[in-house]
C-alpha cells in the first residue's frame, strides 16, 4: 500500500520529502531501483538504477536540485532533499522502491504532497481618491505571496468586515510564479473613514493588516499589524 504524507515549505527554502523503511533495514544498492517522480505527469525528479550512475533522465526543473543520500539508501532511507523550493514544486511526489531479488515488486511506496508558501509583502493602502463627490476609492496592494490570497476590507471602528461587493480584486501571477494582488475599495463618502486592508495567507495562517484613516482634522495614517491566526476561524479578532 502507498503511504501518504504532506509537507510544507517556504519558497526559496530547502525541504526533505520523507521516504524510508523502518529502522534497522539494510539495502543492497545493486538490488534496488528507486524512483522519485511526480504523481500526475510522471516528471522525473531523481532516481537510482543499479549500474547506471548517470542522471541524464532527470527533468531540467529538478537537475542539481533534488538529491538522495547514498549512505541513507543503504539504511533504507530514500528521502529526497529538494533545494530552493519554487511555487511550481507544489504537487504530489511519488517515491517508489523496487527490489530486483523480489521480482521488481515495490518494497516501499510513498506519496508526498508538497504545499508551498510565501509571505506577502506588507500591504500598501493608497491615499483615498475621490472619483466623484459622493464616493471614496482606496487601493490596497501586496506582492510576492503564495498561495493565492484572500483580501478583506475592515471597518476599523468596530472591526467589522466590509461587504465584499464593495471591492474589486485583481490577482496576478508574476514572473516568479508568486501572486501579486491589487484590491480597489469603493465606498460612500462620510465625514470620517477609518478602514483597513487585510491580506490573508490561509496556508501560513497569517494576516497582514494596514489601516488608513481620513477625517476633517486628521491626516491619513497607516498602521501595520501582522497576526498569525492560531484558530481556524477566518479573521477572528485579529485586527486592532
Amino acid at each position: 500500500d502507498t503511504q501518504e504524507k504532506e509537507v510544507r515549505a517556504m519558497v526559496g527554502s530547502d525541504v526533505e520529502l520523507s521516504c524510508a523503511c523502518p529502522e534497522g533495514s539494510r539495502f543492497d544498492l545493486n538490488d534496488v531501483y528507486v524512483y522519485w517522480q511526480t504523481s500526475e505527469s510522471k516528471t522525473v525528479v531523481t532516481y537510482h538504477i543499479p549500474q547506471n550512475s548517470s542522471l541524464e533522465n532527470v527533468d531540467s526543473r529538478y537537475r542539481n536540485r533534488a538529491l538522495m543520500s547514498p549512505a541513507g539508501m543503504l539504511r533504507g532511507d530514500f528521502s529526497l532533499r529538494l533545494f530552493n523550493v519554487t511555487p511550481q514544486d507544489e504537487q504530489k511526489f511519488h517515491c517508489l522502491v523496487l527490489s530486483q531479488s523480489l521480482g521488481f515488486q515495490e518494497v516501499l511506496s510513498v506519496e508526498v504532497t508538497l504545499h508551498v508558501a510565501a509571505n506577502f509583502s506588507v500591504p500598501v493602502v493608497s491615499a483615498p481618491h475621490s472619483p466623484s463627490q459622493d464616493e471614496l476609492t482606496f487601493t490596497c496592494t501586496s506582492i510576492n505571496g503564495y498561495p493565492r490570497p484572500n483580501v478583506y476590507w475592515i471597518n476599523k471602528t468596530d472591526n467589522s468586515l466590509l461587504d465584499q461587493a464593495l471591492q474589486n480584486d485583481t490577482v496576478f501571477l508574476n514572473m516568479r510564479g508568486l501572486y501579486d494582488v491589487v484590491s480597489v475599495l469603493r465606498i460612500a463618502r462620510t465625514p470620517s473613514v477609518n478602514i483597513g486592508c487585510c491580506i490573508e495567507n490561509v496556508l501560513l495562517q497569517q494576516n497582514l493588516t494596514v489601516g488608513s484613516q481620513t477625517g476633517n482634522d486628521i491626516g491619513e495614517r497607516d498602521k501595520i499589524t501582522e497576526n498569525p491566526v492560531s484558530t481556524g476561524e477566518k479573521n477572528a479578532a485579529t485586527w486592532s
Partner: nanobody, 121 residues
Amino acid sequence: EVQLVESGGGLVQTGGSLRLSCAASSSTSTSSIDVMGWYRQSPGKQRELVASISSFGSTYYADSVKGRFIISRDNAKNTVNLQMNNLKLEDTAVHFCNLRRLSPPPLLDYWGQGTQVTVSS
C-alpha cells in the same frame, strides 16, 4: 500507451494445467529495461506477484508456485507466457499481466484487464 491483452484463463481440475499468454501492443525501445509479470488477486485479498521475468532474463517465482509454474517471454513478439502445472484450489484467482518499464525513468506500469483461473476439485 501500451495495451496488454491476456488469454488462456479458464476452468480446470486440481492437478491440471493451463497456459496464460499476454501480448503487449507495442514494444518498449531496445535500450529500455523492463519486467513483465503475472499477478493474481482472489476475493478479499491483495494483488500478489506470481512470477516475473525481466528483459535481461532474471526470473522470480512466489514460493507458493515454485516448481509448478514456468514463466517465459519472447522479446521479439512482446509476449510473456505463464505455464501453470499441477494446479491447486488456492490458485483460483483473477490473473493480471503487468509490464513495468524500469529504465529509462520514469517508472511506468501497464496492466491487462485480467483473466479468470478457476481450479475445481
